[in-house]
């Protein structure tokens, strides 16, 4: 029969024959022969391969360097890499999460729209009319102005995006 020019899924072509790829978590030791199957070995401790492969080396698990603010979010296996995330108050600088930066704070006049996570920074939004923020914070949302009316008071000083309204007593009408 004609030697194959293409192989099935999870196979590879070598020496005019189709050999089985090694399964995830294993590396190649020796190609198959016409008499024997591909010889594979499991990846070692702290190594992985996440696809059907013909690699002769396994990949090293990622190291979550605490000096860069990183910690392990999910321990790697022979088939998956370690997933790193950042320590509390920090977030990754990239999708690969190779280093961390401190969460951004929202300045006065801005509130937190979305609190930062290990992988995303704080999202700030300007305080709309009727709301204010007088602190620099990574957690505080814009607060609504105090409603003087509900306290039976009147506005003595208008609020801004950075300050609350100041309420005061109503002027008494003299009889």
């Amino acid at each position: 029969p004609e030697p194959p020019t293409a192989c099935r899924e999870k196979q590879y072509l070598i020496n005019s024959q189709c050999c089985s790829l090694c399964q995830p978590g294993q590396k190649l030791v020796s190609d198959c022969t016409e008499f024997t199957e591909t010889e594979c070995l499991p990846c070692g401790e702290s190594e992985f391969l996440d696809t059907w492969n013909r690699e002769t080396h396994c990949h090293q698990h990622k190291y979550c360097d605490p000096n860069l603010g990183l910690r392990v979010q999910q321990k790697g296996t022979s088939e998956t890499d370690t997933i790193c995330t950042c320590e509390e108050g920090w977030h990754c600088t990239s999708e690969a999460c190779e280093s961390c930066v401190l969460h951004r704070s929202c300045s006065p006049g801005f509130g937190v729209k979305q609190i930062a996570t290990g992988v995303s920074d704080t999202i700030c939004e300007p305080c709309p009319v009727g709301f204010f923020s007088n602190v620099s914070s990574a957690f505080e949302k814009c607060h609504p102005w105090t409603s003087c009316e509900t306290k039976d008071l009147v506005v003595q000083q208008a609020g801004t995006n950075k300050t609350d309204v100041v309420c005061g007593p109503q002027d008494r009408l003299r009889a």
Epitope: V29, D31, E39
Partner: antibody, heavy 112, light 109 residues
Framework: SVKESGGGLFKPTDTLTLTCTVS????????ISWVRQAPGKGLEWIGI??????TYYASWAKGRFTISKTSSTTVDLKMTSLTTEGTATYFC?????????WGPGTLVTVSS | QIVMTQTPASVSAAVGGTVTIKCQAS??????LAWYQQKPGQPPKLLIY???TLPSGVPSRFSGSGSGTDFTLTISGVQCDDAATYYC???????????FGGGTEVVVK
């Protein structure tokens, strides 16, 4: 196929290098094991070199034997400080624990 | 280092009979075990790998079983041509080393 060469008559304390020459497959995706057999005795595993270049040895062989790839088709077994116990037929074979292709062997005789 | 203990050292069988050879590993090796047949003046020939898989071309009268530390090679319906020495070989799953059993001489009467 695989074939060993470099055997012969050697003196104790000599250093010798055996060569395993392969054809029909690539050392970039296949491991090579070395095994020896003293006259009338059983098989004795010496060591292995993987496609990656990583090597492992039997505990008794560490420090006395060195396996290395010397070209895209050859693997050497270097033996230092030969003793008369080194008298054996030395085989190379493709693989780790699926040794289908073996060479015919090369005889090493160590005698004073 | 792993140690493979093979028994018996020698066994005789009549043509058509059955031979059983055992191999014990000093620690668990899963199914990373092979059996070889060797005749005088020849290199070993692979009979079984992964404890129970026969390479194509090896007669079906040869079979292997076992996992962990205990393994068996069985020759059913022994033929004259089966007279040889048989060796087991076990290896660490890490790839860090293997060892052969001491061998079993099979004499066919």
């Amino acid at each position: 196929s695989v074939k060993e060469s470099g055997g012969g008559l050697f003196k104790p304390t000599d250093t010798l290098t055996l060569t395993c020459t392969v054809s029909g497959f690539s050392l970039s995706s296949n491991a090579i094991s070395w095994v020896r057999q003293a006259p009338g005795k059983g098989l004795e595993w010496i060591g292995i070199i993987y496609a990656s270049g990583d090597t492992y040895y039997a505990s008794w062989a560490k420090g006395r034997f060195t396996i290395s790839k010397t070209s895209s088709t050859t693997v050497d077994l270097k033996m230092t400080s030969l003793t008369t116990e080194g008298t054996a037929t030395y085989f190379c074979a493709r693989g780790y624990t699926t040794l289908y292709f073996w060479g015919p062997g090369t005889l090493v005789t160590v005698s004073s | 280092q792993i140690v493979m203990t093979q028994t018996p050292a020698s066994v005789s069988a009549a043509v058509g009979g059955t031979v059983t050879i055992k191999c014990q590993a000093s620690e668990s090796i899963s199914t990373r075990l092979a059996w070889y047949q060797q005749k005088p003046g020849q290199p070993p020939k692979l009979l079984i790998y992964s404890a129970s898989t026969l390479p194509s071309g090896v007669p079906s009268r040869f079979s292997g079983s076992g996992s962990g530390t205990d393994f068996t090679l069985t020759i059913s319906g022994v033929q004259c041509d089966d007279a040889a020495t048989y060796y087991c070989q076990g290896g660490y799953s890490s790839g860090a080393g293997t060892a052969f059993g001491g061998g079993t001489e099979v004499v066919v009467k």
